[in-house]
Interface confidence: low
């Protein structure tokens, strides 16, 4: 028998520093976790105990905080490199900046292969990028050879920018052949590395003939097995076991998200490579794991054009940016309606013709707008301003819902109006009209939605049983505020970028802005 | 059409052994998981363990190691269940049942079941 | 070990009657449950799996729910042929492991 110890991250973005429990920016040092420097000690002191191991990474290390802004993807491959990662696959964020802000800053950047079986390259790309990423790479180990496979989500042009040059096929049908490639190749030991999501990388287990491992991202998944160490709960155990077609039981893992934990899986082969067992669990990187001094000196010297950067004019408004809890918890707010629309801005994908766009519309908890920004400073916007307003460092997610359950999110936006509560939305590409003298749960008389599938975009009413696309908060997602309705009847959820990142690209796209309250939110009595 | 063809009632001393089999037919015997069930007159079900007919590797409750062991024959698409050092406890029904190949593998066919008598 | 715990042990239901038979695990098993159907001296059949998903050619009076650690089956109108032993299993972990069983019986 031949033992693998497989050390596993995914969904990092951009956390290189140490954050607090919850991801956010590090507060009180003594308890905060993660980081490269955290992450290096732990990976090095498990080098040094045991003889085959493996670092790889499933994507969607891009985008996620002030570095990713500012370094824009060399951050990811001077870390990725100090540490020593053996592959990476593609996940969708990497393709944020285009298919330019991954070739030059990590494709020809990293020392280790980064990995996409179902993207497929056309037109003049093709030899731009050829070799630059790989379907598959076969790895010495000890005094054995293990084959990765990667993959990426078919819905990346949906979540992203990879332009038309880019291919992306079904996974299971552009692993099968690779993977046969490999049998062929007389590579017996076979790793899915990809980033679909939990539930594609269980389907990968159950039906590409002869992946032995699945390791994923996308769905930040946490998987355990025991007593978790922290907060987030297990969606099941660590590894995630799944029988596949052809009898074989393949562990399938993701270790949750933001460098937070590194996953740790020890497997067993024996000589015709097939696993006979599986262990581990992620390891939680808290502050009882020292950072390594020559990692963190390298985290301190990069660091030093962040807080440059963050004090540094991205547009100007000339209009008083309302962002108080007085406006924005109570009616339209145009510090709400600047959001929703970079929100908007920040998710144009024309990727059919009878679509001016995927999506029009946007939803924000009232709540989640912390700050004004007086334009009486000589209009200057800065990163720090926008920090003050979105201080929690969350995501603008990509949600489908069905009419109904938007409906039932306004009602729960004014069910209890006038106290000030968080759980007032703002909107875009939304009129509502409440009713405020109906009862709690029947005060939304009017609710129409901006079409998408038009070339003139126009306002129709909202249809109960139709599904639609809608950005939104991660807080929102996951069901903040008392939302718990979005969260439980959701139909699909794909994390999208930095909240900060969205408003300040937006705001320096536009140079100077002036967002109005321009009745998107009204209020009426009597009948409709 | 999908079968599972299991061998006739056995009435064996104590202390002896006794093979049961399991005769697959209809579907591509090594694409699927044998699973072996004991249930004893008027009880529940009990899961013994599983053989995988394509690699030969099995799996076992820990009650049942040493106990029970698990071969198949591809040649003849059967497999057989081996119970040894036999005592009135093992008096039972044994079923054989195919895993299915779907997510969340329930058994989708099962034999007509072996009745199991130990007495001297 | 995951424990299965059935209930109720047995019933009895008239023709046209609406049944539910409850299976509750001793920890998570994320929806990995089956249910079968044994009559007298014959072999399970499958019923339903993944918690709520009908096996092929099973009647459509049979249905499955639940999550976490409740699940349940209900036969929405019961019919005499559905006089049975019926089990659930769970599928989540190793060793799989089945309920004691609920007898339906005919009133």
């Known amino acids: 028998a031949w033992e693998l110890t497989i050390l596993h991250t995914n969904d990092v973005h951009s956390r290189l520093e140490q954050t607090s429990e919850d991801s956010s920016k590090c507060v009180n040092a003594s308890r905060c976790m993660g980081g490269v420097a955290r992450l290096f000690t732990k990976v090095q002191q498990i080098r040094r105990a045991e003889p085959n191991v493996l670092l790889l990474d499933a994507g969607d290390q891009y985008q996620g905080t002030i570095w990713f802004t500012v370094y824009k993807g060399a951050e990811v491959a001077h870390f990725m490199n100090a540490l020593r990662y053996d592959a990476m696959a593609l996940g969708n964020h990497e393709f944020d900046n285009g298919v330019e802000g991954l070739i030059e800053p990590l494709l020809k950047e990293a020392k280790f292969p980064i990995l996409s079986a179902n993207i497929k390259a056309k037109g003049p790309l093709a030899s731009q990028i050829s070799g630059l990423y790989l379907p598959y790479k076969v790895l010495p180990v000890g005094d054995e050879v293990v084959g990765i496979v990667g993959y990426t989500s078919k819905e990346t042009p949906f979540l992203s920018n990879p332009g038309t040059n880019l291919v992306f096929e079904d996974e299971i049908t552009a692993l099968q052949p690779e993977v046969d490639k490999l049998k062929t190749l007389n590579v017996n030991k076979i790793i899915a590395l990809g980033h679909s999501g939990f539930e594609m990388d269980k389907l990968i287990a159950q039906k590409v003939r002869g992946v032995d491992v699945v390791v994923g991202g996308h769905s930040n998944t946490f998987l355990y097995t025991g007593n978790p160490p922290s907060k987030e709960v297990p969606a099941g155990k660590y590894p995630f076991i799944v029988t596949s077609d052809d009898g074989r039981k393949v562990p399938v893992v993701q270790a949750y998200a933001f460098g937070k934990y590194l996953g740790y899986l020890k497997i067993e082969f024996d000589e015709r490579g097939n696993v006979i067992s599986s262990h581990g669990n992620p390891i939680l990187l808290n502050s009882s794991i020292p950072e390594d001094p020559s990692i963190k000196a390298d985290i301190n010297k990069w660091r030093i054009k962040l807080d440059n950067y963050s004090t540094q004019e991205l547009g100007k408004t000339i209009v008083y940016l309302d962002g108080s809890s007085q406006s924005c918890r109570f009616r339209e707010c145009n510090m709400g309606n600047l959001i929703c629309d970079a929100m908007i801005n920040n998710n144009l994908r024309h990727t059919d013709e009878m679509f001016w766009n995927h999506v029009s519309m946007c939803i924000l908890n009232g709540g989640g707008i912390r700050s004004p920004i007086d334009e009486r400073n000589n209009g200057t916007i800065t990163w720090e301003n926008l920090a003050a307003v979105l201080p929690f460092g969350g995501t603008f997610d990509l949600v489908q819902l069905k009419g109904s359950t938007l409906k039932k999110a306004f009602e729960h936006s004014v069910h209890r109006y006038g106290q000030s509560t968080g759980e007032f939305l703002q909107v875009g590409g939304i009129h509502v009209v409440y009713d405020l003298s109906r009862k709690p749960g029947d005060r939304v008389v009017k609710l129409d939605v901006l079409c998408t599938k038009c070339r003139v975009p126009s306002y129709d009413p909202l249809k109960m049983d139709e599904v639609y696309k809608v950005i939104l908060p991660n807080f929102l997602a996951n069901g903040g505020d008392g939302f718990q309705m979005i969260k439980d009847e959701l139909l699909r959820h794909d994390s999208g970028d930095q909240d900060i990142n969205v408003v300040s690209t937006y705001i320096s796209k536009m140079k100077v802005i002036y967002p109005a309250v321009e009745g998107r939110i009204k209020f009426s009595t009597g009948s409709h | 059409q999908v079968q599972l063809q299991q061998s006739g009632a056995e009435l064996v001393r104590p202390g002896t052994s006794v093979k049961v089999s399991c005769k697959a037919s209809?579907?591509?015997?090594?694409?699927?998981?044998i699973e072996w069930i004991k249930q004893r007159p008027g009880q529940g079900l009990e899961w013994i363990g599983l053989?995988?007919?394509?690699?030969?590797?099995?799996n076992y409750i820990e009650k049942f190691k040493g106990k029970a062991t698990l071969t198949a024959d591809k040649s003849s698409s059967t497999a057989y269940m081996q119970l040894s050092s036999l005592t009135s406890e093992d008096s039972a029904v044994y079923f054989c049942a195919r895993r299915g190949d779907y997510y969340g593998n329930p058994f989708d066919y099962w034999g007509q079941g072996t009745t199991l008598t130990v007495s001297s | 070990d995951i424990q299965m715990t059935q209930s109720p042990a047995s019933l009895a239901a008239s023709v046209g009657e609406t049944v539910t038979i409850t299976c509750r695990a001793s920890e998570n098993i994320y929806y990995s449950l089956a249910w079968y159907q044994q009559k007298q001296g014959k072999s399970p059949q499958l019923l339903i799996y993944?918690?709520?998903t009908l096996e092929d050619g099973v009647p459509s009076r049979f249905s499955g729910s639940g999550s976490g650690t409740q699940y349940s089956m209900k036969i929405n109108s019961m019919q005499p042929e559905d006089t049975a032993t019926y089990f659930c299993?769970?599928?989540?972990?190793?060793?799989?492991?089945f309920g004691a069983g609920t007898k339906l019986e005919l009133k």
């Open positions: 299993k769970q599928a989540y972990d190793v060793p799989l492991t």
């Open positions: 053989i995988n007919p394509g690699s030969g590797g099995t």
């Open positions: 209809g579907y591509a015997f090594t694409n699927y998981l």
């Open positions: 993944n918690a709520d």
